[in-house]
């Protein structure tokens, strides 16, 4: 197979015919050294998935349910290109499966038992697989056959295409369960009409169904959405209140050696030449031979799926949960209202050791999961492999953009017993220099910089945000002569100063000696000119407070703070000499796990929090000898957020605006994936 050939998998004679036409037309418009198309015919989409996994083909376009099959071992395929619908200016690559109810009804998602339900059709995504998958563990046993369990869960339903003889309750609201538009309650509009007419109490449809059926806002205001956290929201708020986000139609390829760049190059060229309204001879998104061949006829073009986005992230936790429940038919033994152990995400092996000790002391109420970077941990929480972790504000922003929520804040200044209910204002992000140097905020160009990590608040977002507004470009590695900013590109000058050791050089975790607050300060002590840290870093690592060899003889008076007005002040004066106020670190979790995480952590800190006086012989949650493992070492308690329970409210408008501005310079693959 030539290196630049993409072997497209076709699943019917008609698709194979269109594929050959695609191949021939691409040949006519692409240079001889460009990508080319070859066609491979298989009997089914599942056969195509297997062929790609076995390197007998390279690409195929799949519906969401098949993307799930493609992702499962041993296939291990990943999404590489998404079809989009709507306009180029506002491309839609996903739709949202929602549960719609009338505003004047008074039940929540966890009170659907005994209600009447309207579905688009048996086995369909938004109307059946997703809602029934998510409700699966609430269905009465035995759960097989599924239709019988659903019939016994709701008091009556309309499920078009169901067997009305075997399961009459499923056709109670639409006698016969007709499987076409002859049934007035068939498909999306029909399921909504079933609700509108008062036949049913809830309709399981797409987010767009309400808008397509009710042009008038006043009419739409008579309806609400049921959210998974047992609240309700207006129908406009479907992005924050849905059962699952479903990808429409996706090109998949192998995870390793999958030719994704070549596939994108091919499809990008294809949409330029043969996309909507581009060519008379060949159209990518239609065919005289049949409907939806190779690609959906309704597609308007393609978008490249960000490289960080694997199938789990692409399909989303809710969708995977629903489909897995339906396919595997397994439910936890514990009742669903009981909190299961919380899986904490630990960064690399130092944090993992502390987490393990916590796990042992918590009698298994805490379990541990590891990842090499904070972003990998956030991704694990998103997909359910982990449940929670404590994050710097910069990562609270990324986690928030990825759908996680803040649960508790680390407090550093409020003594107990008021600590748990106090909302602190935050800490100061400062720039520290040696007293012996002549540096000011205005002459940092060409100097050596030390940062906690890329994407963190005090070490990156605040100083680089301020710098960006001064230099108006993102080439920070050119502004400083060299530095250590863990998480930078390995060949960047901002990795040059890092200490490693080798394979971990410049990695954003504790294996890099200059990572974090203490690491950035150590970088200043040993190699750098300026360190961007929190205001407590110098006092916490001088005067013998840090026993490590590099720190034990350091004196606080040998360091000063840079003020934005060009002056310098003592490290004792951060309130009058700082770069900005930073939001405290916070624990984040998935919405569905937030209450359990909060309850458990408040309980854990009563046992292992700052009330424990002797940490040499007892487990202490907020102690790790200046290493800030799992939590910052200066944490006094984890505090309730009250109404600051979204990332925007928690971080504050000013900080969110600053980080959003800095997104122009973002090197966060996860953020790119989460905003796709």
């Amino acid at each position: 197979v030539p290196e630049k050939s993409v072997r497209w998998c076709a699943v019917s004679e008609h698709e194979a015919t269109k594929c050959q036409s695609f191949r021939d037309h691409m040949k006519s418009v692409l240079p001889s050294n460009g990508p080319s198309v070859a066609c491979v015919k298989k009997a089914s989409h599942l056969d195509c998935i297997r062929a790609i996994a076995a390197n007998e083909a390279d690409a195929v376009t799949l519906d969401a349910g098949l993307v799930y099959d493609a992702y499962l071992a041993p296939n291990n395929l990943k999404p590489v290109v998404a079809e989009f619908y709507g306009s180029k200016e506002d491309p839609q690559t996903f739709y949202y499966a929602v549960a719609v109810v009338k505003k004047d009804s008074d039940f929540q998602m966890n009170q659907l038992r005994g209600r009447k339900s309207c579905h688009t059709g048996l086995g369909r995504s938004a109307g059946w697989n997703i809602p029934i998958g998510l409700l699966y563990c609430d269905l009465p046993e035995p759960r097989k056959p599924l239709e019988k369990a659903v019939a016994n869960f709701f008091s009556g339903s309309c499920v078009p295409c169901a067997d009305g003889t075997d399961f009459p309750q499923l056709c109670q609201l639409c006698p016969g369960c007709g499987c076409s538009t002859l049934n007035q309650y068939f498909s999306y509009s029909g399921a909504f009409k079933c609700l509108k007419d008062g036949a049913g109490d809830v309709a399981f449809v797409k987010h767009s169904t309400i808008f397509e059926n009710l042009a008038n806002k006043a009419d739409r205001d008579q309806y609400e959405l049921l959210c998974l956290d047992n609240t309700r929201k207006s129908v406009d708020e479907y992005k924050d209140c849905h059962l699952a986000r479903v990808p429409s139609h996706t090109v998949v390829a192998r995870s390793v050696g999958g030719k994704e760049d070549l596939i994108w190059e091919l499809l990008n060229q294809a949409q330029e030449h043969f996309g909507k309204d581009k060519s008379k001879e060949f159209q990518l998104f239609s065919s005289p031979h049949g409907k939806d061949l190779l690609f959906k006829d309704s597609a308007h073009g393609f978008l490249k799926v960000p490289p960080r986005m694997d199938a789990k992230m692409y399909l989303g936790y809710e969708y995977i949960t629903a489909i897995r429940n339906l396919r595997e038919g397994t439910c936890p033994e514990a009742p669903t209202d009981e909190c299961k152990p919380v899986k904490w995400c630990a960064l690399s092996h130092h944090e993992r050791l502390k987490c393990d000790e916590w796990s042992v002391n918590s009698a298994g109420k805490i379990e541990c999961e590891s990842a090499e970077t904070t972003e990998d941990c956030i991704a694990k929480i998103m997909n359910g492999e982990a449940d929670a972790m404590s994050l710097d504000g910069g990562f609270v922003y990324i986690a928030g953009m990825c759908g996680l929520v803040p649960v508790l804040a680390e407090n550093y200044n409020t003594p107990n017993p008021n600590c748990e209910n106090t909302a602190e204002e935050g800490y100061f992000a400062v720039a520290v220099v040696k007293s012996s140097s002549d540096l000011t905020w205005d002459n940092l160009k060409g100097k050596k910089s030390c940062h906690t990590a890329v994407g963190r608040t005090a070490g990156w977002n605040i100083p680089m945000g301020l710098l960006y507004s001064k230099i108006n470009h993102c080439r920070f590695d050119e502004f400083f002569s060299e530095g250590c900013a863990p998480g930078s590109e390995k060949n960047s000058s901002l990795c040059k100063l890092c200490m490693g050791p080798s394979p971990n050089l410049c990695e954003p975790n504790n294996k890099e000696g200059y990572y974090g607050y203490t690491g950035a300060f150590r970088c200043l002590v040993e190699k750098g000119d300026v360190a961007f840290v929190k205001h407590q870093t110098v006092p916490q690592n001088t005067g013998g407070k840090n026993p490590d060899a590099w720190a034990k003889n350091l004196k606080e008076e040998d360091y000063e703070l840079l003020c934005l007005d060009g002056s310098r002040k003592s490290v004792q004066e951060p309130a009058n000499c700082h770069l900005a106020r930073a939001p405290n670190h916070a624990v984040v979790a998935r919405k569905d796990k937030a209450d359990c995480v909060q309850t458990l952590l408040l309980d854990q800190q009563r046992m292992f929090g700052s009330s424990v006086t002797d940490c040499s012989s007892n487990f202490c949650l907020f102690e790790s000898k200046t290493k800030d493992l799992l939590f910052r070492d200066d944490t006094v308690c984890l505090a309730k957020l009250h109404d600051r329970n979204t990332y925007e409210k928690y971080l504050g408008e000013e900080y969110v605006k600053a980080v959003t501005n800095l997104r122009k310079c973002s090197t966060s693959p996860l953020l790119e994936a989460c905003t796709f």
Epitope: L353, S617, T626
Partner: nanobody, 117 residues
């Protein structure tokens, strides 16, 4: 620095038993949480079992019901009784007292356990 010395490993057939011991120099170990870890070739080091100073225990799912961790504070020793051993239990077993491990990568030499017929 507390020194930890592991012993009791060896070659055993599937279904067999071994008892590992970890002797700590200094009485500090009696008041710390102690744990056994293992590392198989090419794999990450993983927690097998842990025991707090008060005697409450935690086990990895893969060893629950087969392994038992215990401690004798008078002897400054922690034990791991391993029954119904399986080939996948083959690894070097290490013990730790957690006292300084967060910021100092100190481990004993470990003891090799090989389960093979």
């Amino acid at each position: 620095q507390v020194q930890l010395v592991e012993s009791g490993g060896g070659l055993v057939q599937p279904g067999g038993s071994l008892r590992l011991s970890c002797a700590a120099s200094g009485s500090i170990a009696s008041i710390n949480t102690m744990a056994w870890y293992r590392q198989a070739p090419g794999k990450q080091r993983e927690l097998v079992a842990g025991i707090t100073s008060g005697g409450s225990t935690k086990y990895a799912d893969s060893v629950k019901g087969r392994f038992t961790i215990s401690r004798d504070n008078a002897k400054n020793t922690v034990y791991l009784q391993m029954n119904n051993l399986k080939p996948e239990d083959t690894a070097i077993y290490y013990c730790t007292d957690y006292s300084k491990r967060y910021y100092q990568d100190y481990w004993g030499q470990g003891t090799q356990v090989t389960v093979s017929s």
